[in-house]
Amino acid sequence: EPPTACREKQYLINSQCCSLCQPGQKLVSDCTEFTETECLPCGESEFLDTWNRETHCHQHKYCDPNLGLRVQQKGTSETDTICTCEEGWHCTSEACESCVLHRSCSPGFGVKQIATGVSDTICEPCPVGFFSNVSSAFEKCHPWTSCETKDLVVQQAGTNKTDVVCGPQDRLR
């Protein structure tokens, strides 16, 4: 009686179980009662990453330099090419199909996490006691100057965008 289900790494065709092609190979012809499945390796810029019965391999992804993409990891017959973005740019999605500029953190915000090829700058508001007076993609919030440690007093309070201004203590005569 013909099978209704096949083992792992097999497929059902013409009422019989044939072996799937291994990753990196495509199907040329199904097995028969007398012959094994015939598979062929994928070409130079092609891949298949699963056990399969595909008659065509997939083309490796093209990392288009006009979009700011470059190859992070070259594809093989079993894996696709992985793209990343040029320095100063990061991917807009996990698939990394285009790139955008790294964001700078505005005054009043500091860098929590520096951008990479796959993630943007993460900014955080400067908490009380800290400030940032520049727009930057790498500067963290700086602590306010401690006037006391310099034997000075606060003449002007600090904000999230400005440091405190220290001045001399009033001398009692």
Epitope: L67, G68, E86, C99, F138, E139
Partner: antibody, heavy 115, light 112 residues
Framework: EVQLVESGGGLIQPGGSLRLSCAVS????????VSWVRQAPGKGLEWVGI???????AYASWVKGRFTISRDNSKNTLYLQMNSLRAEDTAVYYC?????????WGQGTLVTVSS | DIVMTQSPSTLSASVGDRVTITCQAS??????LSWYQQKPGKAPKLLIY???DLASGVPSRFSGSGSGTEFTLTISSLQPDDFATYYC??????????????FGGGTKVEIK
Amino acid sequence: EVQLVESGGGLIQPGGSLRLSCAVSGFSLSTYAVSWVRQAPGKGLEWVGIIDSGGGTAYASWVKGRFTISRDNSKNTLYLQMNSLRAEDTAVYYCARGVTFFGLWGQGTLVTVSS
Amino acid sequence: DIVMTQSPSTLSASVGDRVTITCQASQSISNYLSWYQQKPGKAPKLLIYRASDLASGVPSRFSGSGSGTEFTLTISSLQPDDFATYYCQAYYYSGGGSYDYAFGGGTKVEIK
């Protein structure tokens, strides 16, 4: 056909403002980054600034807030707003597509700043 | 800001000559260097990107080399269509959210 076409140049007095346009066809501004590059008469090329596919911008250090790049995705057009123009801003202004290099250029539009 | 020093500023050559133009960056730019050809009244045309990659449709007599701060554009056998001005262009990201695209001063290749 993939192309960029600049317009909006002309004669303007010092201190005046001008908005240049760059109409793109054959590709989308929501996919590609585009820069403005200028060239003074008989001189070399000078980068002005860039707008990325998400609308983020960066400028040359000399711009100092005088110029602003923006875009209208529905019209597939980008703009260069130029304020407080000076004689030294006289140049052909090109828009050019690319991230670290410029693979596609428009024909340019001439801006003359003179009284 | 990054400064690109291109030399020579003018070069006299004949058809069939091997021509070399150099570009020096004021600081390391890895391989972020491209070369353009410009003819009078026309927009620049990309020849080479990433220091040595030939742009689409550009004849193989053009080649680029170098990395870091020293770069070279070579035309192996100068053709009548190659008499033009050539520019190098660097891309540099400072890491501080500052982007710089700097062009060399240009090299005019004229008929000897």
